[in-house]
Each structure stands twice: as C-alpha cells, then as structure tokens.
Amino acid sequence: MAVTACQGLGFVVSLIGIAGIIAATCMDQWSTQDLYNNPVTAVFNYQGLWRSCVRESSGFTECRGYFTLLGLPAMLQAVRALMIVGIVLGAIGLLVSIFALKCIRIGSMEDSAKANMTLTSGIMFIVSGLCAIAGVSVFANMLVTNFWMSTANMYTGMGGMVQTVQTRYTFGAALFVGWVAGGLTLIGGVMMCIACRGLAPEETNYKAVSYHASGHSVAYKPGGFKASTGFGSNTKNKKIYDGGARTEDEVQSYPSKHDYV
C-alpha cells in the first residue's frame, strides 16, 4: 500500500511539475521591466523565451516574436534547449510512469517490469527537473549580469544635456514558476525511485523442505533470504500473503517489499 501511495504521489507531483515547466516555458514574463528606482513610464516591458511584449498604460499590449534564430543570444538558445529537453524527458517519463503505476493492470506485467519502468520514469523526472532548474537559473544569472551592467550606465548622457533611460529587467513570474516546477518534478522523480525499490521483488522463496535430523523432527524453511536486487530477477516463486498473516517462521527482521515507504 505504501509503495502504491509513494508511486502515485510521485506521479502526481511530477505531473504538476511538468505542467509547470511547460507553463513557464510558454510564459512571456521571464524578465520584466524593473520599476524600482526608475522614472515612471507609461509603458511596461516584459520578455519571454519566444517573444517580447510591451503593455501600454492605455490598455494595449503588443507582443513580437523573435523571428530570428541566429541573431539570438547563445544563452537564450541554451535556456530554450534546456527547457525543451526538460519537457520532452518529462513527457516521456509521464508516459512510462502511467504504465508503471501499480494501480494500473496491463496484461500480465510483472512487478520487476513495473519496477524497471518506475525507476526509468523516476530518473527521467529527475533529469527533467534538473534541466528546468538549470535553464531558469542560467536565465536568472543572465538577468543579474545585465541588470548590474545597465545599472552601471543607467543614464547614458547625450551631449551632456539629453538623457536616455536604459530599461533594466528583473526576475519575471516565469522564473519562479520554473524553479518551483523543476523542484516538484525532481521531488516526484525521487519519489518514483523510492517506490521502485519497494516494487522490486526482494525475496526468492523456495518450497519448504523437511530435513529429518537424528533425534529431532524439525521443519526448516529457508524463506528469509533476500533475492538479488537486479531487476531481471526471478519472480515466479512469489510468496502470497493471505491477509498479512505469517507463520512464526516467516517473521523476520528483513524488510519485505511492503515495508518501504
């Protein structure tokens, strides 16, 4: 039950995270005009990964796409790439994790296969989250660098008389959405990996054999040995618990596959 809950929760958290990464990637407010300590203008500028927008006080908003590919800064291209990789990996991870969910029965899929798929999707979610966090962080670093550069020459004098105000940009809402979404995807991925450990078959169970020692009649059941943690391990001799009741011999200190949270 705990494994199913962990896996389900990991899936849901990752789903929310990936939805957030997609939202952040599409959002226009990656960088917004810094209003602090700036002359009050009737125009508000903000920029995304794909287009830049201008909102006028009168109520009109105009957005222009970046129709060039080669003319864009390499850092922006890198951020785009990281976000897209994050989305693609996350989407594949979601697809894989759907089939890996313990609560969903697909034919006669064995636990080892589900464990494999859970681990795969977990790793994909982790990498997806890291890509998003990295992308957002690279963009944020770029903003910070540009911010202080533009602060250094906030006003560029023209002939000593006329002043040109340089627009400074600060963190937009998309950065925070991206960080949170990346974090959630990462957490979801970790949860999937934890769930995978619980899904993996942990015991190789042999049929009970009676050994007759001289003078004693003791039945010895070698049931407490752990199976290999390799995902392709034999699962044909699975122990079937009836209502969780165990014989005295079966009570052991080793964790069973139901003990992982």
């Epitope: 009050v40 203008t41 009737a42 500028n45 201008v54 006080s57 009168s58 006329v162 002043q163 040109t164």
Partner: antibody
Framework: QVQLKESGPGLVAPSETLSITCTVS????????VQWVRQPPGKGLEWLGA???????NYNSALMSRLTISKDNSKSQVSLKMSSLTAADTAIYYC???????????WGQGTLVTVSS | DIVMTQSPSSLAVSLGERATMNCKSS????????????LTWYQQKPGQPPKLLIY???TRESGVPDRFSGSGSGTDFTLTISSVQAEDLAVYYC?????????FGQGTKLEIK
Amino acid sequence: QVQLKESGPGLVAPSETLSITCTVSGFSLTTYGVQWVRQPPGKGLEWLGAIWAGGNTNYNSALMSRLTISKDNSKSQVSLKMSSLTAADTAIYYCAKGGYGNAMDYWGQGTLVTVSS
Amino acid sequence: DIVMTQSPSSLAVSLGERATMNCKSSQSLLNSGNQKNYLTWYQQKPGQPPKLLIYWASTRESGVPDRFSGSGSGTDFTLTISSVQAEDLAVYYCQNDYFFPFTFGQGTKLEIK
C-alpha cells in the same frame, strides 16, 4: 460609436472644489483608460491626469495634491475632483479616451469652468 | 517632468506649400522594448477639442489625410504637412506619452499666408 461627454458646474467660487463627470459610451472603462486635459482661455493644453483600465491613476505632479480621479465602471463614468480652486484654474476641461501609444484618440467637447466669486 | 519644446511658435505658409514643425523632448521617448517612440501629435482647430493626428511618432491615426507625416526618434521629432490646405489652419501640439506625467509642447500655430 465612441463618445465622451463632460458635465461640470460652469461657475465655481475660489477655494471651493470642482467636480466634473465624464460619461462615456461605445467602449468599456474596464478595457480603456480615460485622461483629463485642460486648456485655459487662449493658452495651450495641460495634462491633468489619467485613470487606467485597472483603476490605477497618474497625476500632473504640480496638481497632484489637489486632484482626485475616480471611476464607476458600471455607470461608465469618470469623475475629476480638484480642490482649492483659484482663478488660474479657469479653463476648458476635456476628458479623452486612451488609445494606442497612450495617445488620446477620442475627446469630449469639453466643459468650461470659470473660477470667480 | 519632461519638457517638450516646440519650434517655431507660429508658422505661415502658402496653400499647397510644405509645412514643417519641430518638437524636442528633454529625455528620449524611445522605448527599447518595442523600439517605438512615445510621441503624439494633435491638431486643434479654433473652438474645437484637439484631434489625434499621429502616435508612436510616425503612425498616422485612421482617417487622417496622408499629407500629414511624422518622423524622428529619441528626442527630436518633426511633423510635416506635405501640401498645406485651408482646413489645416490650426495649432499643433506634440505630447510626451512615455514618462508620467504626460506633458505637452506649447504648440505651433499654423497660419495661411
């Protein structure tokens, strides 16, 4: 079609408060801003202030302490209140709709306000 | 506040001639976000409210004759009437629509010779 109509008292005593209402039609105050401009007889235009779609306001810095602009979206009305009037406030007061580039694309006919005792 | 300076204060031209008036702002009205200049030109005929001619320094308002054109960028702007007509007799105002508070120039009066 877009229309703006100012309604004012015409004559106001010095030190009193002027209240002008601009009733608009043909557009919504939740979508577009309204700006106020005045013109003393025989002189140039002076921007007074504006109330934007979201309800935020901006004022002429020289008149800020005396000016209040508010609106009632449901009644499609914008009001301008100016306190402590002097003879220098005698002017035609216009309201205008904000358009592209923050320009005023539609204007009311204006209302003449005379400050005199 | 931004100071808008218009020149000349009055301009007399013959019908059919070209009229050019200037407007200078104390700060650049160019917005880097969309590369547009937030300068507006208005025409005010005697006894009438002002009428919008040009916004974004060079974009003609719909219904405005194409003999009116705006140019310039940053701090220096020009309104040109390619062939003056009798109905163009008016005062022309430029306005800063970028920095609050918005400010008008003192106006250029166009007269017919």
